[in-house]
């Protein structure tokens, strides 16, 4: 399986909400001994590998923001802890999973990573990640709403987020 990032860049005004999205692609083993662990974290474009370093998002670690379930089941993070920080991560039945960040500030700008771990008990873990950039802007040059830019593999036109 693979992880797709529909958008590689999100440009948002300060105070806006944004939902960063990843999508699980390809065949998903729904066997009894296969489970999926999904999470989000901030990172940097490291020299060795992008998304290797795991930094907190608004003081919440990737352990706090994880989703756990089998296959394409829906799931949510622990609501209380995340929502106190203006965050919520969620997953649906179609392989989409996302993190919503409310009331953006300039400090939220940076590289965000989604991580999916396919756990084949008795065999191994298979991990894949996706990366996307969030730019929070302020002042007269800031857009009125979030503007998202598709990843290079998709259409190059920018799409305004709903």
């Amino acid at each position: 399986f693979k992880v797709a990032t529909p958008y590689s860049l999100y440009v948002c005004p300060e105070g806006q909400n944004v939902t960063l999205t990843c999508r699980l692609l390809g065949p998903v083993d729904k066997g009894h001994d296969v489970t999926f662990y999904k999470t989000w974290y901030r990172s940097s474009r490291g020299e060795v590998q992008t998304c290797s370093e795991r930094r907190p998002i608004r003081n919440l670690t990737f352990q706090d923001l994880h989703l756990h379930h089998g296959g394409h089941q829906a799931a949510n993070t622990s609501h209380d802890l995340a929502q106190r920080h203006g965050l919520e991560s969620a997953s649906d039945h179609h392989g989409n999973f996302s993190i919503t960040m409310r009331n953006l500030t300039l400090l939220d700008s940076g590289l965000y990573c989604c991580l999916v771990v396919e756990i084949r008990h008795h065999h191994s873990e298979h991990r894949v990640h996706g990366a996307m950039e969030l730019q929070v802007q302020t002042g007269k040059d800031a857009p009125s709403n979030c503007v998202v830019y598709p990843s290079s593999s998709q259409d190059s036109e920018n799409i305004t987020a709903a």
């Epitope: 489970t35 352990q63 994880h66 089998g70 991580l115 771990v117 008990h121 873990e125």
Partner: antibody, heavy 117, light 107 residues
Framework: QVQLQESGPGLVKPSETLSLTCTVS????????WSWIRQPPGKGLEWIGY???????NHNPSLKSRVTISVDTSKSQFSLKLSSVTAADTAVYYC???????????WGQGTMVIVSS | EIVLTQSPATLSLSPGERATLSCRAS??????LAWYQQKPGQAPRLLIY???NRATGIPARFSGSGSGTDFTLTISSLEPEDFAVYYC?????????FGGGTKVEIK
């Protein structure tokens, strides 16, 4: 802050079953791997096995089928049973939280188990 | 199973010196390798994950490097509290395995 605490008898007779429990406090047991690791006196670390929150288990083939790991989410506890013990099973036994695609990030303080008649 | 071989078994150094510890895997573990520190009578503590990333709260004097089969943990300038045993651990597949450890002792 998640904390782990091992409990169980410190002395077990050869051929009997070693039973230990790990109590998880300060966080949920309903996620992650919950693992057992041991360390014979003066030696290195050996991974025994884990139970995943979903109930799936996995253990070190070197221990053959002597290992049983179970979880009681209502008590926030997981347990280890190691059958047919010998003196070679004498060790400090640790419980630990293991994060998928990460590492053992939280450990109990360990409990010494001696196998002797 | 994957065998991890650590060297040297013992490293005798003075505070302020640089420590270089090696871990070699019997087959490639990519960068899925962690390092732990263990002091007498205590549980191990996570230092490094994914070969080169410091865990939360770990001082910058600890650094990891390597990928594939050869890995290094470096302590740039030893502090008195750094004298301990260090273990590497792979997680590319099960069973999870640890190296035999390197003891860093005061010279």
């Amino acid at each position: 802050q998640v904390q782990l605490q091992e409990s169980g008898p410190g002395l077990v007779k050869p051929s009997e079953t070693l039973s230990l429990t790990c109590t998880v406090s300060g966080g949920s047991i309903s996620s992650y791997y919950w693992s057992w690791i041991r360390q014979p006196p003066g030696k290195g670390l050996e991974w025994i096995g884990y139970i995943y929150y979903s109930g799936s288990t996995n253990h070190n083939p070197s221990l053959k089928s002597r290992v049983t790991i179970s979880v009681d989410t209502s008590k926030s506890q997981f347990s280890l049973k190691l059958s047919s013990v010998t003196a070679a099973d004498t060790a400090v036994y640790y419980c630990a939280r293991d994060i998928p695609a990460f590492a053992f990030d939280i450990w109990g303080q360990g409990t010494m188990v001696i196998v002797s008649s | 199973e994957i065998v991890l071989t650590q060297s040297p078994a013992t490293l005798s150094l003075s505070p302020g010196e640089r420590a270089t510890l090696s871990c070699r895997a019997s087959q490639s573990v990519s960068y899925y390798l962690a390092w732990y520190q263990q002091k007498p009578g205590q549980a191990p503590r996570l230092l490094i994950y994914d070969a080169f990333n410091r865990a939360t709260g770990i001082p910058a004097r600890f650094s990891g490097s390597g990928s594939g089969t050869d890995f290094t943990l470096t302590i740039s300038s030893l502090e008195p509290e750094d004298f301990a045993v260090y273990y590497c651990q792979q997680r590319i597949n099960w069973p999870l395995t640890f190296g035999g450890g390197t003891k860093v002792e005061i010279k």
